[in-house]
């Protein structure tokens, strides 16, 4: 029986370790600056890295600019979006800016999109300063179902900071749904 | 066999509970305001509390101003940095400020430092107002290896808010590396 | 013995799954805009949704405007607070604003309140722009005991954005206390 107990313990260690890893999807996606849309209106950002530098993904899928949930669960979602402008980039069309991010969830079954989180600020980026910068951070805990998609919308995408430490979003599973 | 099963269950509860606790390092470090550097340029903040008030640490190490990872894993890292100025503190050398935070990772094996997250804003803190305040929050999910070090760099450190609820950073392990 | 082992494994799967779910309280509370206080001074926000839209709660209690901890543990706490003003809402009493959030913990046993996290910014919302917006995000990792209460205080509550994606706070348990 002792050998059997050891076997039970051993198999359990494997099972617990395996199920724990399988049960924890995550993603950290960083902006792909080679394909940032222009304009000042709200647009969906579709180009993100998932496998270079700090970017990584596991048990989730990145497709068509969206982060797809493969496993039901409660997830912590976050986004960090940085905007910047240097006078050498040219004159701004307006000095009054609305710098915003929207983290949205789309359900395929019911083709509808809903904003989970938003953040940002109106800014006055006057010509008195040669450089302007502003960052937004949002985060929250949400129930996500397999097949649902997370995407990022921003205003003024041409002002995005293209660094991987500046503009990114991500998710990690915290627990199962009861 | 029932007694054996109960024993297995009991030992498993202990094992599961113990391994779960061992597997989840964390830290929440709050600014030590007795030793904030002066200057307006980017500096590394080396004085943090780890065992008073809200500050705490477990299965990680704080040494030489850096948070040292003791256990491989995926961690959620975060920082909250508050800057403030009251006219009674003296005159600002410039009203145009770049208030920034950089969360950096240093690897001992490959002596190099990389920025994981950055945030902040350019601000115009005019003399028309007697008090100014601004906070930055950043957070993200990163793979950290044992021996790697996390540190915080800020601009204008003399403007930091010294309260423990204002200026802090932390990390907690979410899952193992596959 | 094989049948017994299968039974052990089966009961363990149930037990592990059940205990894991029981061990992970969470809440995501969104602003109830039907009852936002007026004024510009710091006030405690007591009206939050816990069961509609993105709002949800499990193994925690929402009562009297406070999020009550039912289970000892280390929790990640977060808040996202959005302020906005449109000129059609009327003139601001002052264009110099202090837009702040304070996440506080109250212990019933020792009737005292302490600020865990704060964030915000001073803003100059001039009449030159018809619309103003600003969001704050804070987050951190804290030890919470059963019976302790989390509440949100803000300045200028009449400027709060009432959308569920804009003004919310939450918590989720990450690990037990050793």
């Amino acid at each position: 029986i002792r050998a059997e107990k050891a076997m039970v313990d051993g198999s359990w260690l494997d099972l617990a370790k395996r199920s724990k890893l399988e049960a924890q999807p995550f993603a950290h996606l960083t902006i792909n600056a080679t394909d940032i849309p222009s304009g000042s209106h709200k647009v969906s950002l579709s180009s993100w890295y998932h496998d270079r530098g700090w970017a990584k993904i596991s048990n989730m899928t990145f497709s068509n600019g969206k982060l797809i949930v493969n496993q039901d669960g409660f997830y912590y979602l976050y986004a960090n979006i940085c905007f910047r402008h240097h006078e050498t980039s040219g004159d701004l069309a307006t000095e009054y800016l609305q710098l915003m991010v929207y983290v949205t969830k789309t359900s395929i079954k019911i083709p509808s999109s809903h904003t989970l989180m938003k953040g940002g600020s109106t800014k006055y980026w006057s010509g008195n300063s040669e450089f302007h910068f502003y960052s937004i951070n949002v985060g929250g805990f949400f129930k996500l179902r397999s097949g649902e998609e997370i995407s990022i919308e921003v205003s003024n995408p041409s002002l995005l900071d293209p660094d991987q430490d500046a503009t990114y979003f991500g998710a990690f599973k915290v627990r199962d749904i009861d | 066999i029932r007694a054996e099963k109960a024993m297995v269950d009991g030992s498993w509860l202990d094992l599961a509970k113990r391994s779960k606790l061992e597997a989840q390092p964390f830290a929440h470090l709050t600014i030590n305001a007795t030793d904030i550097p002066s200057g307006s340029h980017k500096v590394s903040l080396s004085s943090w509390y780890h065992d008073r008030g809200w500050a705490k640490i477990s299965n990680m190490t704080f040494s030489n101003g850096k948070l040292i990872v003791n256990q491989d894993g995926f961690y959620y890292l975060y920082a909250n940095i508050c800057f403030r100025h009251h006219e009674t503190s003296g005159d600002l050398a410039t009203e145009y400020l770049q208030l920034m935070v950089y969360v950096t990772k240093t690897s001992i094996k490959i002596p190099s430092s990389h920025t994981l997250m950055k945030g902040g804003s350019t601000k115009y803190w005019s003399g028309n107002s007697e008090f100014h305040f601004y906070s930055i929050n950043v957070g993200g999910f990163f793979k950290l290896r044992s021996g790697e070090e996390i540190s915080i760099e800020v601009s204008n450190p003399s403007l930091l808010d010294p309260d423990q609820d204002a200026t802090y950073f932390g990390a907690f392990k979410v899952r193992d590396i596959d | 013995i094989r049948a017994e082992k299968a039974m052990v494994d089966g009961s363990w799967l149930d037990l592990a799954k059940r205990s894991k779910l029981e061990a992970q309280p969470f809440a995501h509370l969104t602003i109830n805009a039907t009852d936002i206080p007026s004024g510009s001074h710091k006030v405690s926000l007591s009206s939050w949704y816990h069961d509609r839209g993105w709002a949800k709660i499990s193994n925690m209690t929402f009562s009297n405007g406070k999020l009550i901890v039912n289970q000892d543990g280390f929790y990640y706490l977060y808040a996202n607070i959005c302020f906005r003003h449109h000129e059609t809402s009327g003139d601001l009493a002052t264009e110099y604003l202090q837009l702040m959030v304070y996440v506080t913990k109250t212990s019933i046993k020792i009737p005292s309140s302490h600020t865990l996290m704060k964030g915000g910014s001073t803003k100059y919302w001039s009449g030159n722009s018809e619309f103003h917006f600003y969001s704050i995000n804070v987050g951190g990792f804290f030890k919470l005991r059963s019976g302790e209460e989390i509440s949100i205080e803000v300045s200028n509550p009449s400027l709060l954005d009432p959308d569920q994606d804009a003004t919310y706070f939450g918590a989720f348990k990450v690990r037990d206390i050793d």
Epitope: E130 | H41, G90, L92, A93, T94, E95, L97, Q98, S158 | -
Partner: nanobody, 127 residues
Framework: EVQLVESGGGLVQPGGSLRLSCAAS????????MGWFRQAPGKGREFVGF????????YYADSVKGRFTISRDNAQNPLYLQMNSLRPEDTAVYYC????????????????????WGQGTLVTVSS
């Protein structure tokens, strides 16, 4: 890497005028507080003047007060030192530098309070 480049120096007769410029490249410093210093042959570096980032406050050494004026463009890089009523004792290499503190301290006239020095531009006042 930050670089400051001074220009505008030259030979001028006593009583004449010169306008020095200081341009920054690399990191943004157009809105940092800055200072002008000078070093005469065989002497130490001497404080000339200081200007805040907004240009709203200036300080001068007693030896140049009323004759020299520091200014800066609204948004562009250059920092200026307008020198009038020049004297032979103003002969020196003139340097601009970035003030390193967030607050204006009582030691703003000390060279140790400044970073990112330029190479300097020579001003010679002689008849």
């Amino acid at each position: 890497e930050v670089q400051l480049v001074e220009s505008g120096g030259g030979l001028v007769q006593p009583g004449g005028s010169l306008r020095l410029s200081c341009a920054a490249s690399g990191r943004t410093f157009s809105r940092s507080a800055m200072g002008w210093f000078r070093q005469a042959p065989g002497k130490g570096r001497e404080f000339v003047g200081f200007i805040t980032g907004s240009g709203g406050t200036t300080y001068y050494a007693d030896s140049v007060k009323g004759r020299f004026t520091i200014s800066r463009d609204n948004a562009q890089n250059p920092l200026y030192l307008q020198m009038n009523s020049l004297r032979p004792e103003d002969t020196a290499v003139y340097y601009c530098a970035v003030y390193r503190r967030t607050y204006i301290s009582s030691t703003y006239s000390e060279s140790s309070e400044y970073d990112y020095w330029g190479q300097g531009t020579l001003v010679t006042v002689s008849s």
